[in-house]
């Protein structure tokens, strides 16, 4: 009597939604064994836990496979929302960037955050800085007290996306000229200008003098 009751009771469980895809199922614990290719998933509801058989694993779980044994295992990667395997994340929690199966609050060096997908993509790769160039001003290396020196670096690898900016590839800084005065009397344009002004002034002065002399002579002749 008791056994027959248990058997009919068990048979009725098959219609229970949690018994879908099960090879063995009970009212209290749900599925204990799944049909081939389905994933066993231990669903937890407060203190209660029961087995289910699923075609694919829910968010936060991945399909853990052993020969003829499939199970939904929890993603254990920090800040990961869904993963492909034990140690490879495919989607991070909000505010974290996905990079090589892991989740970061900021992208590692050499990688740039792509906000629309929240992934770290290869940034713009630049080479090493060159040595500082010669101190110059107006393409001259003498004749001034201060000038600018420049150094550059090459873009080794262009970024994966055009929207990702490259870091600066040239920078300049103020420097002191090696020679303030140019050798061989060569003067700077400013010095030349000063000299020309002086000349001009002298010419005007001389012209004015000559004009004064001319006026005086003219009066005398009258």
């Amino acid at each position: 009597q008791g056994n027959r009751w248990r058997r009919s009771k068990r048979a009725s469980y098959v219609s229970n939604p949690i018994c879908k895809g099960c090879l063995s199922c009970s009212k209290d614990n749900g599925c204990s064994r799944c049909q081939q290719k389905l994933f066993f998933f231990l669903r937890r509801e407060g203190m209660r836990q029961y087995g289910e058989c699923l075609h694919s694993c829910p968010s936060g779980y991945y399909g853990h496979r052993a020969p003829d044994m499939n199970r939904c295992a929890r993603c254990r990667i920090e800040n990961c929302d869904s993963c492909f395997s034990k140690d490879f994340c495919t989607k991070c929690k909000v505010g974290f960037y996905l990079h090589r199966g892991r989740c970061f609050d900021e992208c590692p060096d050499g990688f740039a955050p792509l906000e629309e997908t929240m992934e770290c993509v290869e940034g713009c790769e630049v080479g090493h800085w060159s040595e500082w160039g010669t101190c110059s001003r107006n393409n001259r290396t003498c004749g001034f007290k201060w000038g600018l020196e420049t150094r550059t670096r090459q873009i080794v690898k262009k970024p994966a996306k055009d929207t990702i900016p490259c870091p600066t590839i040239a920078e300049s800084r103020r420097c002191k000229m090696a020679m303030r005065h140019c050798p061989g009397g060569k003067r700077t344009p400013k010095a030349k200008e000063k000299r020309n002004k002086k000349k001009k002034r002298k010419l005007i002065e001389r012209a004015q003098e000559q004009h004064s002399v001319f006026l005086a002579t003219d009066r005398a002749n009258q």
Partner: antibody
Framework: EVQLQESGPSLVKPSQTLSLTCSVT????????WSWIRKFPGNKLEFMGY???????YYIPSLKSRVSITRDTSKNQYYLQLNSVTTEDTATYYC?????????????WGQGTLVTVSS | DIKMTQSPSSMYASLGERVTITCKAS??????LSWFQQKPGKSPKTLIY???RLIDGVPSRFSGSGSGQDYSLTINSLEYEDMGIYYC?????????FGAGTRLEIK
């Protein structure tokens, strides 16, 4: 009632092959997972691997190169072969079964057979 | 492989006493833990699976609890027939691994 029974030689010489049989009654080996477990003299238990209902096998990495689990469904028996044995393989060998993640693991065990590796 | 650290390795307890054996996994094993009892000359017997589910026929004085990496087996009121070696087993990940065992003896 599911019953498992191990059988095979109790003494094996070093470098030889250890061969054991597990005879199953009360259940079919075409259902569930059928494994081998051994217990070393210091009481340490080690799971060695299993053969599934479809005949697929899993072996622990440390034994993969020298272990083999096979079956004969007509006899409802499965077998363990461990090659190139050393004295370190001296242990009590058990066959045991389980039916999936949601059920009890190794719910049924054989009584165990002690295998000594010695020249 | 996941390492299961069981403690104590051996213990003496009095009849009627409450006994607790613990198992710590080297990583989160998501409740995939079983407890076994082995008596001298016998094969191991499953007591508990999935952390806290008692096998039919196992006395209710046995109970299991835990989550993440830490699990325990409690015998509420120790009886003479409870002496033996107790093992934990993780089956969260292959290869499944056992604890080293706890030898329980009656004082």
């Amino acid at each position: 009632e599911v019953q498992l029974q191990e059988s095979g030689p109790s003494l094996v010489k070093p470098s030889q092959t250890l061969s054991l049989t597990c005879s199953v009654t009360g259940d079919s080996i075409t259902s569930g997972y059928w494994s081998w477990i051994r217990k070393f003299p210091g009481n340490k238990l080690e799971f060695m691997g299993y053969i599934s209902f479809s005949g697929k096998t899993y072996y622990i990495p440390s034994l993969k190169s020298r272990v083999s689990i096979t079956r004969d469904t007509s006899k409802n028996q499965y077998y363990l072969q461990l090659n190139s044995v050393t004295t370190e393989d001296t242990a009590t060998y058990y066959c045991a079964t389980y039916h999936g993640y949601g059920g009890p693991w190794f719910a049924y065990w054989g009584q165990g057979t002690l295998v000594t590796v010695s020249s | 492989d996941i390492k299961m650290t069981q403690s104590p390795s051996s213990m003496y307890a009095s009849l009627g006493e409450r006994v607790t054996i613990t198992c710590k996994a080297s990583q989160d094993i998501d409740s995939y833990l079983s407890w076994f009892q082995q008596k001298p000359g016998k094969s191991p017997k499953t007591l508990i699976y999935l952390t806290n589910r008692l096998i039919d026929g196992v006395p209710s004085r046995f109970s299991g609890s835990g989550s993440g990496q830490d699990y325990s087996l409690t015998i509420n009121s120790l009886e003479y027939e409870d002496m033996g070696i107790y093992y934990c087993l993780q089956y969260d990940e292959f290869p499944v691994t056992f604890g080293a065992g706890t030898r329980l003896e009656i004082k």
